[in-house]
C-alpha cells in the first residue's frame, strides 16, 4: 500500500452531553478527489469500526442516517464529531483515510485520539 501521513490530536475530552470533536488531517500525495474516512475504536486490544463515510471533494461528508458520527471536510482536513458517548466509550479513536480516486490508491492511519468521556453526575433531588 502507498502510505500517507494522517494527523489527529492526542487527547480530546468529550462534553458533558457526550459529544467529542476532533480534526483528522491527511497529507495527500496526489490529487485526491474521492476520499473515504473511517473512525476505528481501539480498546483492550480490540479494534471496532465506529463509522465511515466516502465523499467527493467539494461535496458534503455524509455518514449513514443512524451513524453516531457527523463531519465536514475542508481541503485535506476532516472535522469529525462523535455523539452519544458515555464513560464506557472512553478509548482510542483512530482516523483511517483512504484516497479512493483517482488512482493510485493511498492509505493512511493516524496514531489515534484518546477520547475521555465522563458521565455527568445525576442532579440531586431539590426541594421546592
Amino acid at each position: 500500500c502507498k502510505a500517507m501521513h494522517v494527523a489527529q490530536p492526542a487527547v480530546v475530552l468529550a462534553s458533558s452531553r457526550g459529544i467529542a470533536s476532533f480534526v483528522c488531517e491527511y497529507a495527500s500525495p496526489g490529487k485526491a478527489t474521492e476520499v473515504r474516512v473511517t473512525v476505528l475504536r481501539q480498546a483492550d486490544s480490540q479494534v471496532t469500526e465506529v463509522c465511515a463515510a466516502t465523499y467527493m471533494m467539494g461535496n458534503e461528508l455524509t455518514f449513514l442516517d443512524d451513524s453516531i458520527c457527523t463531519g465536514t471536510s475542508s481541503g485535506n482536513q476532516v472535522n469529525l464529531t462523535i455523539q452519544g458517548l458515555r464513560a464506557m466509550d472512553t478509548g482510542l479513536y483512530i482516523c483511517k483515510v483512504e484516497l479512493m480516486y483517482p488512482p493510485p490508491y493511498y492509505l493512511g492511519i493516524g496514531n489515534g485520539t484518546q477520547i475521555y468521556v465522563i458521565d455527568p453526575e445525576p442532579c440531586p433531588d431539590s426541594d421546592f
Epitope: T33, M57, P103, P104
Partner: antibody, heavy 120, light 112 residues
Framework: QVQLVQSGAEVKKPGASVKVSCKAS????????INWVRQAPGQGLEWIGD????????NSNQKFEGRVTMTVDTSISTAYMELSRLRSDDTAVYYC?????????????WGQGTLVTVSS | DIVMTQSPLSLPVTPGEPASISCRSS???????????LYWYLQKPGQSPQLLIY???NLASGVPDRFSGSGSGTDFTLKISRVEAEDVGVYYC?????????FGGGTKVEIK
C-alpha cells in the same frame, strides 16, 4: 433511468477547437465523476480524462495535456470536453461515461458518442 | 503507462459453445489492499461500450452469469460459458490501478 446524452457530430478544420457536451439525467449529477474516452475509426478506446462535478477538479491523460479542457455546468447537469489545436488524428468518436464507486470506479453508463471529424 | 495486451485479435465462435479471451498487463494490477483493478467492457456493433466485469471477477448489474472473469496479477481471462448471438462485439479489458486509465486493443467476437 440514467442517461448521458451527447451533442451531435462535428466537422472541424485542423488547428480549430471542438467542444462536446454530455447532459446527464436520472441521477444526482454531483455524485459521480464523468470520464471522457475516445475511439478513432476502427481503433480501440483511449482515456482522455475525468472531472469531479462538485469542484471542477480534473485529471487528464498527459497525451492531451494543454489541449484538453473539461468543465461542468451543474445547473443543467452537463459536462463539457473541449479539445483545441485539432489534428487529423483527432478524428474519433468521443464518449462521456459515468464512474460508479460501487464498481470501484468503473464506467457504468456511457453516452451515445459524438463523432468529431478533422479534415481540411 | 500500463500496457494492456489482448489475445486473440479475432475470435470466431459457435452459439452454445464456450469462448475465452485473454488479457495481459505490463504491471501487476493486484494492489496490496487486495483489490485487482481490472475491468472488462463489451462494445456491441454500433453501440457504446458497456461494463461487464469489475475488480477482475465481479459481474456488473444485469450481466448474464454465463460471463465470468478470473486471473492473477498480470494474466486475466474472460470466459463465456455458452455463447449467444447477442454476445458478438468487441471485448476490451481495462485497468485503473494507475493514471492514465488504459484499455486493451480489443478482441472481436463473431459468429462462425
Amino acid at each position: 433511468q440514467v442517461q448521458l446524452v451527447q451533442s451531435g457530430a462535428e466537422v472541424k478544420k485542423p488547428g480549430a477547437s471542438v467542444k462536446v457536451s454530455c447532459k446527464a439525467s436520472g441521477y444526482k449529477f454531483t455524485d459521480h465523476f464523468i470520464n471522457w474516452v475516445r475511439q478513432a475509426p476502427g481503433q480501440g478506446l483511449e482515456w482522455i480524462g475525468d472531472i469531479n462535478p462538485n469542484n471542477g477538479g480534473t485529471n487528464s491523460n498527459q497525451k492531451f495535456e494543454g489541449r484538453v479542457t473539461m468543465t461542468v455546468d451543474t445547473s443543467i447537469s452537463t459536462a463539457y470536453m473541449e479539445l483545441s489545436r485539432l489534428r487529423s488524428d483527432d478524428t474519433a468518436v468521443y464518449y462521456c461515461a459515468r464512474l460508479r464507486r460501487e464498481y470501484f470506479y468503473a464506467m457504468d453508463y456511457w453516452g451515445q458518442g459524438t463523432l468529431v471529424t478533422v479534415s481540411s | 503507462d500500463i500496457v494492456m495486451t489482448q489475445s486473440p485479435l479475432s475470435l470466431p465462435v459457435t452459439p452454445g459453445e464456450p469462448a475465452s479471451i485473454s488479457c495481459r498487463s505490463s504491471k501487476s494490477l493486484l494492489h496490496s489492499n487486495g483489490i485487482t483493478y481490472l475491468y472488462w467492457y463489451l462494445q456491441k456493433p454500433g453501440q457504446s461500450p458497456q461494463l461487464l466485469i469489475y475488480q477482475m471477477s465481479n459481474l456488473a448489474s444485469g450481466v448474464p452469469d454465463r460471463f465470468s472473469g478470473s486471473g492473477s496479477g498480470t494474466d486475466f481471462t474472460l470466459k463465456i460459458s455458452r455463447v449467444e448471438a447477442e454476445d458478438v462485439g468487441v471485448y476490451y479489458c481495462a485497468q485503473n490501478l494507475e493514471l492514465p486509465l488504459t484499455f486493451g486493443g480489443g478482441t472481436k467476437v463473431e459468429i462462425k
